[in-house]
Amino acid sequence: LPAQVAFTPYAPEPGGTCRLREYYDQTAQMCCSKCPPGQHAKVFCTKTSDTVCDSCEDSTYTQLWNWVPECLSCGSRCSSDQVETQACTREQNRICTCRPGWYCALSKQEGCRLCAQLRKCRPGFGVARPGTETSDVVCKPCAPGTFSNTTSSTDICRPHQICHVVAIPGNASMDAVCTSTSPTRSMAPGAVHLPQPVSTRSQHTQPTPAPSTAPGTSFLLPVGPSPPAEGSTGD
């Protein structure tokens, strides 16, 4: 039979290559079948018999057509600061991503190595750039005429209300207090909240759990108002 319609195993033509979903077995010197995702090579091919494939065992996987003798182990369970966005199956590894209110501070090939809590801007500061799944919030001081009186990872600086008669002038951390009954805003306040990072999960209120730490991960409780709370997954 011509090579293009040959059944595995077969010897490739000189200088030729094996077809899609086949590999060249050095020992048998034949083109042999690869195993499909979710399976691995239980018995390698010979000159007269093709590859024998078998299903991956629990907690192991192969994602590609392959001829590996053993399936790959799925990653460890997701840590408490993460959610499982892709379960471990015979065809795919587990993927852990940071939960709402957290971001990935250090990524790995699939998923996240280190999650950290999104920065909360203190009063007088507003969100200049919202957090994403892979970047922290950036805060900025509220410019004259604007304020933020919250500690939040979503609140922006809002304009002071305009008073007919000012009782107490506003500043960066406090709105103006009016003596009249119908204050107006200096401009349309816009959305006070910036969206939480895009996620496939439903959003909840910002969690403030005690961060978890995997063995071997440095976890420093900093002075004072604790800058980044962080957690990690074991590799």
């Epitope: 501070a105 950290a116 950036v138 805060c139 900025k140 001081p141 440095s218 900093p222 800058p227």
Partner: antibody, heavy 121, light 107 residues
Framework: EVQLQESGGGLVQPGGSLNLSCAAS????????LSWVRQTPGKRLEWVAY????????YYSDTVKGRFTITRDNAKNTLYLQMSSLKSEDTAMYYC??????????????WGQGTTVTVSS | DILMTQSPASLSLFVGETVTITCRAS??????LAWYQQKQGKSPQLLVY???KLAEGVPSRFSGSESGTQYSLKINSLQSEDFGTYYC?????????FGGGTKLEIK
């Protein structure tokens, strides 16, 4: 234990360049904002540059803007300061510092031992 | 730029005395102020942040206070290890400027 170790200082002629590095250990580097602060021979402290944890946001003092560049490599736990068009007034001890966690925790909580930069002909 | 005017520039005191160092900001810095101590040949160390909060491990004889744009660092019953140079620094808008320093010497 948090450690910040600067290197790369030395003697350079006016108009020359120098690259400072800061190797960090003992904390989750990629979650912290970092800065460079210098101390002049007259003992005045001057904040030089800042970079946020993800390297997205950088700020500079007016005295170095356009001449110095702050960068970081979170995979290597290292902070950098590229200095060009150096002037005699850049002569100082340069400290790598952790912080501020700007807008949230505004302070420098750890300082390195410093590296000396001398700009002179 | 926000100017931080620190006073006095230097002073000489006995162990056991009380001292107050002040820093005046040229505009409102909303309590975004830190105090550092630096000893000869060493790097500065954080003492106080947010104007009034003591950093971890700092003795309670140190205290920070504020009144408008004036910020103060008070050291009760000076100990020999308290002598050195003290700096204030604001963290409002950039540049984050330092005060000129107060050199505290032992008498």
């Amino acid at each position: 234990e948090v450690q910040l170790q600067e290197s790369g200082g030395g003697l350079v002629q006016p108009g020359g360049s120098l690259n400072l590095s800061c190797a960090a250990s003992g904390f989750a580097f990629s979650t912290y904002d970092l800065s460079w602060v210098r101390q002049t021979p007259g003992k005045r402290l001057e904040w030089v540059a800042y970079i946020n944890n993800g390297g997205i946001s950088t700020y500079y003092s007016d005295t170095v803007k356009g001449r110095f560049t702050i960068t970081r490599d979170n995979a290597k736990n290292t902070l950098y300061l590229q200095m060009s068009s150096l002037k005699s007034e850049d002569t100082a001890m340069y400290y790598c510092v952790r912080g501020p966690f700007y807008g949230s925790a505004n302070y420098f909580d750890y300082w390195g031992q410093g590296t000396t930069v001398t700009v002179s002909s | 730029d926000i100017l931080m005017t620190q006073s006095p520039a230097s002073l000489s005191l006995f162990v056991g005395e009380t001292v107050t160092i002040t820093c005046r900001a040229s505009e409102n810095i909303y309590s975004n102020l830190a105090w550092y101590q630096q000893k000869q040949g060493k790097s500065p160390q954080l003492l106080v942040y947010d104007a009034t909060k003591l950093a971890e491990g700092v003795p309670s004889r140190f205290s920070g206070s504020e009144s408008g744009t004036q910020y103060s660092l008070k050291i009760n019953s000076l100990q020999s290890e308290d002598f050195g140079t003290y700096y204030c620094q604001h963290f409002w808008v950039t540049p984050w400027t330092f005060g000129g320093g107060t050199k505290l010497e032992i008498k």
